[in-house]
């Protein structure tokens, strides 16, 4: 059962796993959620009745029954991990904590103009977990405006104390705001020979890489495959670091793979979600339960629904035994990974999908693209919405994209003459416009947020957000698309599609079935040549064939230019403007979404 509220002046008794320090109960809850075993926690706030050495302690707890006895205690705040909840969660913490000094290893000290600049420095430094900044009111003259970058083994402070005129905060790497290089390569036949900070068992290099990404100290990794000559090291995932942040020595060794933490590009790839099945593979660990199940998929469901289950092994049924049901072994360990991995015993193993909600929903697999043809099929573009106006009569107005459970991203020019959000309706999960009847459910629009620098589509800033009155429940036919990460600014997208119900030629009508077209991106320089009378800015992106023939058109406005990269779809552009439709040497012009990520986050995360 999901319990989100915090219990004031309440302490959970027993079940302690470990104690960390956090600046707030809210952040303690996040730390508990991301810990492999924590289900409950007790946080101690600052209070005259409490020993100051216990202030800001966050005790992570576990319980077989998923609950613990409650005891009244002043200044204690307790609660449950979000593991039990179905809503999406994030480690992103933008809060700034006033008059708190978060202790750690101070490895870098420099002058900064503001706490924000200090936080940016931390976010752009590969080792930094959190920072403390002495403001210009700090009593000691030589320490004023000093920005201390800090790290610890756990990523959380080793202690937190009260200190006047300082502020502290965390790196925003987990908010996808780092400008650090994103290095996605996995190097075969390579061992990085730097110091190990931890080791876990993993079924493949991709899982090893994901574990490295969410491990606070891991910057790169080496994985020994199941063919590695030394038997005791097979399936071993070594989590590594170095002073420079880069591997110092690379050794060529067959059957080993190495790669990097994806912490600076984490919003465009799944990090926590290990969704594959591993055939002829047994995961060993502490046994939680043994249940009969029809298939390995059913076993994974059972594991996902059991809050303490971290991974499983399914043994298929022998011939006609047990009504064709096999045995599903639900398992756990101290770190969330198998204690050993064995091959050749016929088991099928995998991980809980409970942690998938810690990744952006937009990274989860969707239906494969249907190649050829121009009509889409249901569920092919689950982020695409149709925006209707009801005034003077109901009609399709523009396209849009689901980017969050209460947010649609679209074009600002769609709202010319729209006096009020009350006349707007957002329909999701729609393939054919003819499906929309009077009783078809829709989302009302609470607020239209148009970029304040928008004047007209051709001059840029053609971007708008719609805040919905109710939240979208994600399903196979309605789910969000990922925003491009600032760390991926330099990605060259080669698999881009424009979709919409718009005209198929300049003088036409709105289409019934959602149309799709694969369109290549065009450089801004090339695009500028085609539009001499306009200024094509870096906040615009162009797409189209030189010979024309495929393009967005009237009615597609506001809809997505969706590009697939590393198996994840990204909202690269918003259909904005162009000269005619599909004309030769006249590419379509789209709002370049990556340039507005900060604006989108600012508007959607505002309290």
């Amino acid at each position: 059962e999901c319990v989100t509220q915090l219990l004031k002046d309440t302490c959970f008794e027993g079940g302690d796993i470990t104690t960390v320090f956090t600046p707030s109960a809210k952040y303690c809850q996040v730390v508990c959620t991301y810990h492999p075993r924590c289900l409950l926690f007790t946080f101690t706030a600052e209070s005259p009745s409490e020993d100051p050495t216990r202030w800001f302690t966050c005790v992570l707890k576990d319980s077989v029954t998923e609950t613990l006895p409650r005891v009244n205690r002043t200044a204690a705040i307790s609660g449950y991990s979000f593991k039990q909840c179905s809503h999406q969660i994030s480690a992103c913490n933008k809060d700034i904590y006033v008059d708190l000094d978060m202790k750690g290893i101070n490895y870098n000290s420099s002058v900064a103009k503001s706490a924000q600049e200090c936080q940016e420095r931390c976010t752009d430094d590969v080792h930094c977990h959190f920072f403390t900044y002495a403001t210009r009111q700090f009593p000691s003259l030589e320490h004023r405006n000093i920005c201390l970058l800090k790290h610890t083994q756990t990523g959380t402070p080793t202690r937190i104390t009260k200190l006047d005129k300082v502020v502290s905060g965390f790196s925003l790497k987990s908010c996808a705001l780092s400008n650090l290089a994103c290095i996605r390569d996995i190097f075969p036949n390579t061992v990085f020979a730097d110091s190990n900070i931890d080791s876990v068992m993993a079924p493949d290099a991709f899982v090893c890489g994901r574990i490295c990404t969410h491990h606070p100290g891991c910057l790169f990794f080496t994985f020994f495959s199941q063919e590695w000559p030394k038997e005791s090291q097979r399936n071993l995932c070594l989590l590594k670091t170095s002073e420079s942040g880069l591997p110092s020595t690379r050794i060529k060794k067959s059957k080993a793979l190495s790669g990097f933490s994806l912490q600076s590009c984490r919003h465009s790839i799944p990090v926590f979600c290990h969704s594959s099945f591993y055939h002829d593979t047994d995961f060993l660990g502490e046994e939680l339960d043994i249940v009969a199940a029809k298939s390995h998929e059913a076993c994974q469901k059972l594991c996902t629904n059991a809050v303490r289950c971290q991974f499983f092994t399914y043994t298929p049924a022998q011939a006609s035994c047990n009504e064709g049901k096999g045995k599903c072994y639900l398992k756990l360990s101290s770190n969330g990974s198998p204690t050993k991995i064995l091959h050749g015993r016929g088991g099928i193993s995998g991980y809980t999908l409970r942690l998938c909600k810690m990744d952006n929903e937009c990274t989860t697999k969707i239906k494969p693209r249907i190649v050829g043809g121009t009509a889409s099929v249901r569920g092919e573009w689950p982020w695409q919405v149709t925006l209707h106006t009801t005034s003077p009569t109901q009609r399709h107005l523009c396209g849009g994209s689901i980017i969050g459970n209460q947010w649609i991203l679209t074009a600002a020019h769609c709202f010319y003459g729209v006096e009020s959000p009350k006349i707007l309706r957002v329909y999701s999960g729609i393939l054919n416009q003819s499906e929309i009847k009077e009783d078809t459910s829709f989302f009302g629009v609470q607020e239209i947020i148009i970029h304040d620098q928008y004047k007209m589509a051709e001059s840029g800033y053609d971007i708008a957000l719609l805040k919905l009155e109710t939240t979208v429940n994600y399903t196979d036919s309605q789910r969000p698309i990922c925003l491009p990460s600032k760390g991926d600014r330099n990605v060259i997208y080669t698999d881009c599609w424009v979709t919409g119900w718009g005209y198929r030629k300049l003088r036409d009508k709105i289409q019934n079935t959602l149309q799709k077209a694969k369109i290549p991106l065009v450089t801004n320089e090339e695009c500028q040549k085609r539009y001499r009378g306009h200024k094509i800015t870096h906040k615009m992106i162009c797409a189209g064939y030189r010979e024309g023939g495929k393009d967005a058109c009237k009615g597609d406005s506001g809809g997505p230019l969706s590009c697939k990269h590393n198996e994840v779809w990204h909202l690269v552009g918003i259909t904005s403007w162009g000269e005619g439709c599909a004309q030769r040497e006249r590419p379509g012009v789209y709002t370049n979404v990556v340039e507005y990520v900060d604006w989108i986050l600012e508007k959607t995360q505002a309290v």
Epitope: D124, N179, L180, A181, I183, D185, G245, P247
Partner: nanobody
Framework: QVQLVESGGGLVQPGGSLRLSCAAS????????VGWFRQAPGKEREGVAA????????YYADSVKGRFTISQDNSKNTVYLQMNSLRAEDTAVYYC?????????????????WGQGTLVTVSS
Amino acid sequence: QVQLVESGGGLVQPGGSLRLSCAASGYTFNNNFVGWFRQAPGKEREGVAAIYSLGGSTYYADSVKGRFTISQDNSKNTVYLQMNSLRAEDTAVYYCAGAITWVPPLSHRRYTYWGQGTLVTVSS
């Protein structure tokens, strides 16, 4: 002692091409970031392109994407910047720089070693 030496600059007409080279001694490009930066008179130094030599991951400023290509030859310990479709606004002194830590690839403040620079002038 680390030395980075740029070459290949010169005068070129708009629309033309140039290839800059950066040769290193006392510093190996392998396992490090190498960046090309430029500085026009009266302007701040800006990142143009960078490469992480181990895997060849490349990073470009928006203003040069699609026109400039950064590449490496590890055997010669040299990094190149191929510049096509040059414009007047590309006129600047181009610097090669080496980093010894994991960096924001186009942030000049985070690079440790610098060459003397080579002048590129785009003019008709």
